[in-house]
């Protein structure tokens, strides 16, 4: 009866979230059945996150629009096993922006979901940033040193990364 | 989509109360973690309170709390904020904002997490 009526719930949650990505891949976690964790298809999923590369070229702005029109925001990088997660979907060629810019051009760093900038994990380029103009950063290639961020003007396109919470059924 | 319009602004003398509503149309509400931020002439936009998705979660700008009051009604499709002991520091043009959630505990206080946006409603205040 326990079990019937959590199906029940469960599957009313699914057809809830369906309105806004009608696709989700499910896992059970631990050994209790209770606990679902989900990200919409195709996103992918590190610990307790999931993630999704957007393709599409777009400002800042709009790419964060983009991200909370999903449920998500342009990614937060706390640690280094995470940035080491998303590289590996990230294309060489390519750049991508991360949740993290200076409004006011005074070289105060703040993460979109107000998470603490913390210097001791920040993963910049060398000589990253560099122009009080550049409010906006980017997780890019460079043959030198891998990947690593770069400070750009807000406004000129590109790729970008969401980032949501993991969907508990 | 959301679509959101504010209503309930208006003239008031400081010391009154006012109740603004914000209605939402399109998907389905209850997925909406919803905010109220506000924007005084020559200002920048300001958070005031937000509203998880289930109700179960408020928060407020130190500058209005104890005086403001967010609330939602997700089978009206809307949201409320009761404004008490009005200053005229409180003299703003009022916005409702949505961001889809599927945390029902979360709730955001930065504008950029915000997707949809109300026209917004005039609050004036004399003394």
């Known amino acids: 009866n326990f079990m019937y009526s959590k199906t029940v719930k469960r599957l009313s949650k699914l057809r809830e979230y369906q309105q806004y990505h009608p696709s989700l891949t499910c896992v059970m976690e631990g050994k209790d059945i209770e606990d679902w964790s989900c990200c919409p298809t195709p996103w992918t999923s590190f610990q307790s996150s999931c993630y999704f590369i957007s393709t599409g070229m777009q400002s800042w702005t709009k790419s964060q629009k983009n991200c909370s029109v999903m449920g998500a925001d342009l990614v937060v990088i706390n640690t280094r096993e995470e940035q080491d997660f998303i590289i590996q979907n990230l294309k060489r060629n390519s750049s991508y922006f991360l949740g993290l810019s200076d409004p006011g051009g005074r070289r105060h760093w703040q993460w979109v979901d107000q998470t603490p900038y913390n210097e001791n994990v920040t993963f910049w380029h060398s000589g990253e940033p560099n122009n009080l103009d550049e409010r906006c950063a980017i997780i890019n290639f460079r043959s030198s040193e891998e990947w690593g961020w770069n400070d750009i003007h807000c406004h000129v396109p590109q790729k970008s990364i969401c980032k949501m919470k993991k969907i508990y059924i | 989509q959301v679509q959101l319009q504010e209503s309930g602004g208006g003239s008031v003398q400081a010391g009154d109360s006012l109740r603004l509503s914000c209605a939402a149309s399109g998907r389905t509400f209850s997925g909406y973690a919803m905010g109220w931020f506000r924007q005084a002439p020559g200002k920048e936009r300001e958070f005031v309170a937000t509203i998880s998705t289930s109700g179960s979660s408020t928060y407020y700008a130190d500058s209005v709390k104890g005086r403001f009051t967010i609330s939602r009604d997700n089978a009206k499709k809307s949201v409320y904020l009761q404004i008490n002991s009005l200053k005229t520091e409180d003299a703003a043009v009022y916005y409702c904002?949505?961001?889809?959630?599927?945390?029902?505990?979360?709730?955001?206080?930065?504008?950029?997490?915000?997707?949809?946006w109300g026209q917004g409603t005039q609050v004036t205040v004399s003394s």
């Open positions: 904002a949505a961001r889809l959630s599927f945390d029902n505990t979360a709730f955001y206080t930065s504008a950029i997490r915000y997707s949809y």
